[in-house]
Interface confidence: low
């Protein structure tokens, strides 16, 4: 077993490790979300700027402050262009969000065009009919029952967005769309010990060859991408869409980064790669806005004048606009998108944020100097609710993303989205999707809590995002009821 | 894990030619692609070739293009690097590295093979 002397030999403070466990005992036994630790950890040293940690017996850095952060993630990111996740890269392993740096570099160029303004003013119209469709699903149910628990709800709605703006697939029923979820679920939801394995023992599942995915999440997005390809006789179809870009790239049979020069770095685009791709888009673009949604629902129930001032301006901007929810009237809505905003300083779902130093690396204004390989965390939930940066930090204030308010604030003080060049590729399309939806709830719907609304919402333990516990129970009142 | 190991470095006069093998074994089929690469002392390594196990393509790195040439032998697991034309600076540490699928870095390397050119 490795000791743990490791940080008290460089002098850097840090929380008493465990046997075995490190600092990590809690989400290592799935007591508490892995994101909820980090922000305790973080608190726990409110005056350094770097904290020496031990998930399970792996020494790591917790930065908590903001300027060594910048230097992280945008001025130094050639250090750190690695997430340092090690494991197989068969498989679903060589996905966008996985990948080591320099494939990372080869992948992010050919997919950054798919979030263009002009490719994501195509996919609103999907996201539109996606939206009608769920409205007209919620007006049916209010008819039998008010309450609904919004986190699986809201699900029903994204998956069917990212399937058709990605994939070109039309799920018809609730049926189809709940059979998909709980196969893709499983990624999110299914305790796998795998991370906690590459935390004792860094690469072994690389060298084992071993996945931290499902075999049955494999498969279904293996069915997925055949499916999908033999439709379009593997050939891009003129849709544009995500599935397009990928047999665009299935015909070039390769991607190339920069590193050695050109064929040399290149990747082989097999149809495990788009496997892979397919795999990070369908997960990142359906729990991540659902469960954002499902928070700001909640808030909104809780908060109602905060409520009244986002329907007043929805009903202002709707009636300039006959009735009709566009693209650009989802932008020029400024009080709903700082809403949004502040939902996800409260609740930022992708916890902790992680990169791999590629070489030996002083630590801007500190002595420390980090070991090649190392891996450097950062808790955007620590930051994100120390009364440093936000005054009253548990309170939900969308005033705080005033511009006034924005401009005043570190730049690394919110990070829902990371940050710097490989910060998330899909951050538009997430508020897109999920403004589009809220837009249309509130137009139509008021939110009140419900005799099941737990006040004091818990993260779940078991989720490798931040998500509610037990879900989330509001009551949606038609507001044709409401006087 | 995917086992290197290179052979046929050793000192030669300049204009001479040298043949360079690397013999994988363990878990080949995970390789996608093998490279050659050279450390010079004082330098960084440096990619000269690569070749791809399936389809047999071909990089070169400017500096030896003409005067290196990489292949291999599916039946042997071997890759061998064949240079002509030797010169003073290419005296070096030569590595034989692999590539897995799904990755662009070289994640399996052997020991080296010191390669002295003398004037």
């Known amino acids: 077993m490795r000791t743990f002397n490791y940080w008290k030999k460089r002098n850097v403070r840090g929380p008493e490790p465990v046997v075995f466990f490190g600092n990590l005992k809690d989400s290592a036994l799935r007591k508490k979300n892995m994101g909820v630790v980090m922000e305790e950890l973080y608190n726990m040293f409110p005056e350094e700027k770097v904290i020496g940690i031990y998930r399970m017996t792996s020494p790591c850095l917790l930065v908590r402050d903001l300027d060594v952060i910048k230097h992280i993630m945008i001025k130094d990111f050639e250090v750190f262009s690695d997430r340092g996740v090690e494991f197989s890269k068969e498989g679903l392993g060589s996905n966008l969000f996985h990948a080591d740096g320099e494939t990372w570099r080869a992948l992010g160029n050919r997919f950054t065009p798919i979030f263009t303004s002009g490719k994501l003013k195509n996919m609103f119209y999907l996201m539109h009919e996606g939206a009608d469709n769920f409205i007209d699903h919620v007006s049916a149910e209010c008819e039998k029952n008010q309450e609904f628990e919004v986190h699986s709800l809201l699900q029903t709605y994204t998956m069917s967005t990212i399937a058709a703006c990605a994939f070109g697939i039309s799920y018809d029923s609730i049926g189809d769309k709940v059979k998909a979820l709980d196969i893709v679920d499983k990624i999110i939801s299914e305790p796998s010990y795998a991370i906690e394995l590459d935390m004792m023992y860094p690469g072994l599942l690389s060298k084992l060859n071993l996945s931290i995915f499902p075999t049955v999440v494999k498969n279904f997005f293996k069915s997925l991408v055949d499916n999908i390809v033999a439709q379009r006789n593997g050939k891009p179809s003129g849709r544009n869409d995500f599935m397009d870009l990928i047999l665009e790239l299935r015909q070039l049979g390769e991607v190339t980064s920069n590193k050695y020069g050109s064929s040399a770095s290149s990747l082989e685009i097999t149809d495990e790669v788009i496997c892979a791709q397919a795999f990070v888009f369908y997960i990142a673009g359906y729990e991540t806005s659902a469960t954002t949604m499902a928070y700001m629902i909640y808030q909104l129930a809780l908060n109602p004048d905060i409520q009244n001032k986002l329907i007043a301006e929805v009903d202002e901007v709707l009636k300039a606009n006959d009735g009709k929810v566009t693209y650009d009237t989802v932008k020029e809505m400024k009080y709903l998108n700082k809403a949004f905003d502040e939902t996800l300083r409260m609740y930022s779902i992708v916890e902790p944020l992680q990169r791999k130093a590629t070489r030996d690396y002083k630590i801007p204004g500190t002595d420390v100097v980090i070991e090649k390989d190392t891996i450097v965390l950062i808790s955007p939930r620590g930051i994100h609710y120390d009364p440093k940066y936000y005054d009253n930090p548990k309170q939900f204030n969308p005033d705080r993303f005033d511009a006034e308010e924005v401009g005043k604030r570190h730049p690394c003080a919110y990070l829902p989205f990371g940050l710097g060049q490989r910060n998330c590729i899909g951050m538009r399309f997430g508020r897109l999707q999920s403004l589009l939806c809220i837009t249309k709830i509130l137009s139509k719907f008021r939110i009140e809590p419900s005799k099941n609304t737990d006040r004091n919402l818990q993260v779940e333990p078991h989720r490798g995002l931040i998500g509610p516990k037990g879900g989330i129970r509001v009551n949606a009142i038609p507001r044709k009821l409401v006087s | 894990q995917v086992q290197l190991q290179e052979s046929g470095g050793g000192l030669v006069q300049a204009g001479g030619s040298l043949r360079l093998s690397c013999a994988a074994s363990g878990r080949t089929s995970r390789s996608y692609a093998m490279g050659w690469f050279r450390q010079a002392p004082g330098k960084e390594r440096e990619l000269v070739a690569d070749i791809a196990w399936s389809d047999g393509r071909i990089y070169y790195s400017d500096s030896v293009k003409g005067r290196f040439t990489i292949s291999r032998d599916n039946a042997k697991n071997t890759v061998y690097l064949e240079i002509d034309s030797l010169k003073p600076g290419d005296t070096a540490v030569y590595y034989c590295?692999?590539?897995?699928?799904?990755?662009?870095?070289?994640?399996?390397w052997g020991q080296g093979t010191q390669v002295t050119v003398s004037s």
């Open positions: 590295a692999s590539r897995a699928r799904g990755t662009v870095l070289y994640n399996y």
